[in-house]
């Protein structure tokens, strides 16, 4: 793996220290030919929770052009999943012409949508 | 109880420095973004800068970047600006808040505030 | 930057009376806004989160509503005490902006 990259099941994992918008956060993964994690797993879940800790964090899931997308092209339907209860409710009431389209680890690793401008951290991941 | 309390106002010349502390107590604030807001007089708040928990993320206003460094120091529950070449649009009355979350949650609890006056 | 249009900018009401403040952002912004109260002198007060959420010991006088880009203040009825500016925000994303201020007056 790269410097400052952690390698873990035959990927490698950069953790974001600062905040983006989901958009900028998946750019910056594609600068570094990498992208937004997908978790795959309750195993990566877990190793992926440990290393973010308790903060906001974005990954590779979305739904902006409709049905929710791995970033990488992973099924969607039938992989894995930890939403938090009663998530994602792509709440349509903000008013910023769509739902809440991105999906991020909460405080305690399970995962919701959010409006995709909130400036949270971010995961990229490449497959070795 | 939950406290801020700012200090290092006063009254400086354009083009000098000043460096502003916010004590934290009666909360773990280690846990806590912190914010600066500036109000100069007779106007409305203006967002100078945030701080992550950590220390690990940073974002100014505009009106400050490159001149304004915010820092802080959770082993002495200490939050400071350091404000460097200043102008006189820099006077104001400077508040510390706390975030309600790590850094992206919002003010809840804020200072009384210290006054810093850039005049010749 | 997300620009913050708060209305009226002062307004006068007496003891009792029903207080409404709008705050308009040039974007949305969810609903993620907050309100503060200010007195002369005095530092802010948090008053209102997530556009809707009372922060703790605030009465319940005060509430607010909206999401994406239109939101309201409500003081269901004006006391002597509440006679100061209040304040919008935005807390969606960086910088973080403030409204221009409504300062209600006793009437």
């Known amino acids: 793996c790269p410097v400052n990259w952690v390698e873990h099941e035959r990927s490698c994992y950069w953790f974001s220290r600062s905040g983006k918008a989901w958009a900028d956060a998946d750019n910056y993964c594609r600068l570094e030919d990498a992208h937004l994690v997908v978790v795959t797993s309750w195993e990566e879940q877990k190793f992926v929770q440990h290393h973010i800790g308790p903060v906001n964090t974005w990954m590779g899931l979305h739904d902006q052009n409709g049905p929710w997308k791995w970033v990488d092209g992973t099924d969607y339907e039938t992989g894995f999943k930890n939403w938090r209860p009663e998530q994602p409710d792509d709440w349509y009431g903000h008013g910023l012409g769509g739902g809440e389209d991105c999906a991020h680890f909460t405080d305690d690793g399970r995962w919701n949508d959010d409006v995709c401008q909130r400036p949270y951290r971010w995961v990229c991941e490449t497959e070795l | 109880q939950v406290q801020l309390v700012e200090s290092g106002g006063g009254v400086v010349q354009p083009g000098r420095s000043l460096k502003l502390s916010c004590a934290a107590s009666?909360?773990?604030?280690?846990?806590?973004?912190m914010h600066w807001v500036r109000q100069a007089p007779g106007k409305g708040l203006e967002w100078v800068a945030v701080i992550w928990y950590d220390g690990t993320n940073k974002n100014y206003a505009d009106s400050v970047k490159g001149r304004f460094t915010i820092s802080r120091d959770n082993s002495k529950n200490t939050l400071c600006l350091q404000m460097n070449s200043l102008r006189a649009e820099d006077t104001a009355v400077y508040y510390c808040?706390?975030?309600?979350?790590?850094?992206?949650?919002?003010?809840?609890?804020w200072g009384q505030g210290t006054t810093v006056t850039v005049s010749s | 930057d997300i620009q913050m249009a708060q209305s009226p900018s002062s307004l006068s009401a007496s003891v009792g009376d029903r207080v409404t403040i709008t705050c308009r952002t040039s974007q949305g912004i969810g609903k993620y806004l907050a309100w503060f109260q200010q007195k002369p002198g005095k530092a802010p007060k948090s008053l209102l989160y997530?556009?809707?959420s009372l922060q703790g010991g605030v009465p319940s006088k005060f509430s607010g509503s909206g999401s994406g880009t239109d939101f309201t203040l409500t003081i269901s009825s004006l006391q002597p005490e509440d006679f100061a500016t209040y304040y919008c925000?935005?807390?969606?994303?960086?910088?973080?902006?403030f409204g221009g201020g409504t300062k209600v007056e006793i009437k």
């Open positions: 009666g909360f773990t604030f280690s846990t806590y973004g």
């Open positions: 925000q935005q807390y969606m994303t960086y910088p973080l902006t």
């Open positions: 808040a706390r975030d309600q979350g790590v850094g992206y949650d919002g003010l809840d609890v």
């Open positions: 997530k556009a809707s």
